[in-house]
Interface confidence: medium
């Protein structure tokens, strides 16, 4: 897998889209993993609804928002308040049974806002570290949550 | 395999300056977020500072802000800690390290190069 | 900012031996922890990375434990060339924070 690069500034929130072939995944579940290590586990962020009809619901864990267009084959993630600690690299998953395949990767680059005069120091971020040949970028700054779009609350 | 090297290091009088470099081969550098952490003789590790892969964003420990300024070519495949104003503090090994991706521990090192300031 | 505090300082053992050197935080960091190994005129080298994953070619003598405040490097069979000073480092959230580092010598 190629991997694509989303590109969003902090505070404001970040959409990254997973496109799949619909039939080829019909009737399984998606989830949004962080991969921890080269070699490590993808530790799960999120995942779609355990009912796989009501996947277009959208399911928080925290400040990420996981929704499915099983019609359309498309994964849709919300990074909400993007803050520099959510940069790095993540998976898109279509799992079956206890398995997952990796529907995308994606790297998540977060760049400081402009507009916030806060000092950068003070802000940290992460990295992002295996090698990416043809890494495609999209700058992809989403709208923020619509009025009446409640978040389960964050998890420590 | 990946290797990191740095230069550019020497001695310095305090207030002057010195630019570091660090050629970096064996992964796609455009591809990595990168940066500097230095030690000084017979004392721990400290972060420097960090920039995005793209260069797009750049940060500092509050120790050399404004002093210090990082930079990358991703063209040259190369690192740079652009250093003024040095101060004897600032005496140290600088190593130039890439970070895994989203987790800011660093998987590899360069050998370093020694920065001294005195007068 | 977390401070990282480890202990001992220093540490003398023997080839063989079994040996944890222990690192605390100042408040709670979940599992994001990190731990190196460097020996004199080197670069650190990473060896274990979220509290307890091996980085790749880590021998399996080294294994990391511990969430919260308290964490864990064991080498349970001490060989030559482990003798070096081992960092803990505080990952993941800011700011960036090394241990002071333990130094592991030959008894």
């Known amino acids: 897998h190629n991997t694509t690069v989303f590109q969003g500034v902090a505070g404001q929130s970040l959409q990254v889209s997973c496109p799949y072939d619909s039939m080829k995944h019909w009737g399984r579940r998606k989830a949004w993993c962080r991969q921890l290590g080269e070699k490590g586990p993808c530790q799960r962020v999120v995942s779609t609804h355990n009912l796989w009809l009501l996947s277009f619901l959208r399911r928080w864990n925290g400040s990420t928002a996981i929704t499915d267009d099983t019609l359309g084959g498309t994964l849709t993630i919300t990074l909400r308040n993007l803050q520099p600690h959510d940069a790095g690299l993540y998976q898109c998953q279509s799992l079956h049974g206890s398995e997952a395949d990796t529907l995308r990767k994606v790297l998540v680059e977060v760049l400081a806002d402009p507009l916030d005069h806060r000092d950068a120091g003070d802000l940290w971020f992460p990295g992002e570290s295996e090698s990416f040949e043809d890494a495609h970028v999209e700058h992809s700054i989403s709208r923020s949550l619509l009025e009446g779009e409640i978040p389960f609350p964050p998890t420590s | 395999e990946v290797q990191l090297l740095e230069s550019g290091g020497g001695l310095v009088q305090p207030g002057g300056s010195l630019r570091l470099s660090c050629a970096a081969s064996?992964?796609?550098?455009?591809?990595?977020?990168m940066a500097w952490v230095r030690q000084a003789p017979g004392k721990g590790l400290e972060w420097v500072s960090s920039?995005?892969?793209?260069?797009?964003?750049?940060y500092y420990a509050d120790s050399v802000k404004g002093r210090f300024t990082i930079s990358r070519d991703n063209s040259k495949n190369t690192l740079y800690l652009q250093m003024n104003s040095l101060r004897a503090e600032d005496t140290a090994v600088y190593y130039c390290?890439?970070?895994?991706?989203?987790?800011?521990?660093?998987?590899?090192w360069g050998q370093g190069t020694l920065v001294t300031v005195s007068s | 900012d977390i401070q990282m505090t480890q202990s001992p300082s220093s540490l003398s053992a023997s080839v063989g031996d079994r040996v944890t050197i222990t690192c605390k935080a100042s408040?709670?960091?979940?599992?994001?922890l990190a731990w190196y190994q460097q020996k004199p005129g080197k670069a650190p080298k990473l060896l274990i990375y979220?509290?307890?994953n091996r980085f790749t070619g880590v021998p399996s003598r080294f294994s990391g434990s511990g969430s919260g405040t308290d964490f864990t490097l064991t080498i349970s069979s001490l060989q030559p060339e482990d003798f070096a000073t081992y960092y803990c480092?505080?990952?993941?959230?800011?700011?960036?924070?090394f241990g002071q580092g333990t130094k592991l010598e030959i008894k």
């Open positions: 390290a890439k970070e895994w991706a989203g987790s800011g521990y660093f998987d590899y």
């Open positions: 064996g992964f796609t550098f455009s591809n990595y977020y």
């Open positions: 920039l995005t892969n793209s260069g797009g964003s750049t």
């Open positions: 408040q709670n960091v979940g599992n994001n």
């Open positions: 979220y509290t307890s």
């Open positions: 480092q505080r990952i993941y959230n800011s700011p960036w924070t």
